[in-house]
Amino acid sequence: KFSKQSWGLENEALIVRCPRQGKPSYTVDWYYSQTNKSIPTQERNRVFASGQLLKFLPAAVADSGIYTCIVRSPTFNRTGYANVTIYKKQSDCNVPDYLMYSTVSGSEKNSKIYCPTIDLYNWTAPLEWFKNCQALQGSRYRAHKSFLVIDNVMTEDAGDYTCKFIHNENGANYSVTATRSFTVKDEQGFSLFPVIGAPAQNEIKEVEIGKNANLTCSACFGKGTQFLAAVLWQLNGTKITDFGEPRIQQEEGQNQSFSNGLACLDMVLRIADVKEEDLLLQYDCLALNLHGLRRHTVRLSRKNPIDHHS
């Protein structure tokens, strides 16, 4: 249950997360399981521990083995195991099965291929993508953030896709590649002009000064998996990232849910330590897809504090 397989290629970066989780305040220690020898935390080492992460910069075939992580809370130690295998680079084009990440399926309307494990790394766009070892070229292929989008997907697009990116650690660059299979399936779906379920148009949200507040922007876009649909928040008509108020943040990543077969997305706006000036702002929930954009506006009003126990 608390063991995880990880793999990589020699001379590439490999970062492994401890299969046991904890709080930011918990300390995490890493050990070589066979020798019980502690893994150093100093970054000058090629293999070093950094909290929940074990970093091989770069990896070597000899690093293969089982690693133990112990997440230490004040009163309980949680133990996990990372089974790491580092392979020699293949001289030919074929990617063996043991290097493949989980297969993803796509359709004409949705053809996102996420680059596996990329969230563990410190990388900057753009990603490079390859299919069956050939660099992808042409307007049908678009590298967007951590995924590849293929326009007008056809059955011939099925195959093995490799993403390649650079991990940066203290100014040093390390290459990383990851490969997964992509299959194409037929899907009877449709897309609609976005329908915002929450918040209601011109909604007044009561908040307590000094407390945290959450606003959820939730919209549906049609049936089946959607191609290019998004929800986001704006403050006074400005993107959250451009507004420059660190207390107000959008929740990273959009949650996709299917209610009654509809494809819906939601984005949470988190306001820490609500201040008087926050009541003066206009909060816009935006939902957009290929059909267009819909906007619902929310304003905040002060509510009297209530007992927060019950």
Partner: antibody, heavy 120, light 111 residues
């Protein structure tokens, strides 16, 4: 908004087993770092920690009562259940469940409590 | 078990004055440089309410009149200035070791 509510019998006979349910909202016990604990308070006395359960099903008990206590969770129902066997009149108390949150481990939200009397 | 001893058992303070409650632990409650000591307020018929966590952090929504200090084994809850509605029992609690333990409580009355 985090809320918790305790439910269970108000009167229990000696030697019987007490089953208390904590139903909560505003958080999920499948989220890393979350926990729910039980605390009791005899009339006019101090608080006593009984047990708590974490997001990953790690359970911790008060050693003085461990042989009598069982704590379980039902993540889908947002519930935590505490059972206490072989009840005795000295177990008469208000029983609270509480949320363990924050970067560190402490009770930051409490239920209103449920009063349990042990008497024949 | 870590035993927490509060003093005084009770005290009476006039509005506008300072109230100081101390809590001594039988062993250190430090963990990675942090003191795992909390303070709770409990009014009659109500559940405890978190005031201070990890020794000195004031919980959101708690008035700045409440402050906590200390490290290792000796901790203090200070209420300054005291107001009439501060009448309550106050408990310290450690989460450094199982069993988590509470102090025996301090009863604060307003004159």
């Amino acid at each position: 908004q985090v809320t918790l509510k305790e439910s269970g019998p108000t009167l229990v006979k000696p030697t019987q087993t007490l089953t208390l349910t904590c139903t909560f909202s505003g958080f999920s016990l499948s989220t890393s770092g979350m926990g729910v604990g039980w605390i009791r308070q005899p009339p006019g006395k101090a608080l006593e920690w009984l047990a708590h359960i974490w997001w990953d099903d790690v359970k911790q008990y008060n050693p003085a009562l461990k042989s009598r206590l069982t704590i379980t969770k039902d993540t889908s129902k947002n519930q935590v259940v505490l059972t206490m066997t072989n009840m005795d009149p000295v177990d008469t108390a208000t029983y609270y469940c509480a949320h363990i949150g924050g970067d560190y481990d402490y009770f930051d939200f409490w239920g209103q409590g449920t009063t349990v009397t042990v008497s024949s | 078990d870590i035993v927490l001893t509060q003093s005084p058992a009770s005290l009476a303070v006039s509005p506008g004055q300072r109230a100081t409650i101390t809590c001594r632990a039988s062993e250190s409650v430090e963990y990675s440089g942090t003191s795992l000591m909390q303070w709770y307020q409990q009014k009659p018929g109500q559940p405890p309410k978190l005031l201070i966590y990890v020794a000195s952090n004031v919980e959101s929504g708690v008035p700045a009149r409440f402050s906590g200090s200390g490290s290792g084994t000796d901790f203090t809850l200070t209420i300054n200035p005291v107001e009439a509605n501060d009448t309550a029992n106050y408990y310290c609690q450690q989460s450094r070791k199982v069993p988590w333990t509470f102090g025996q409580g301090t009863k604060l009355e307003i004159k």
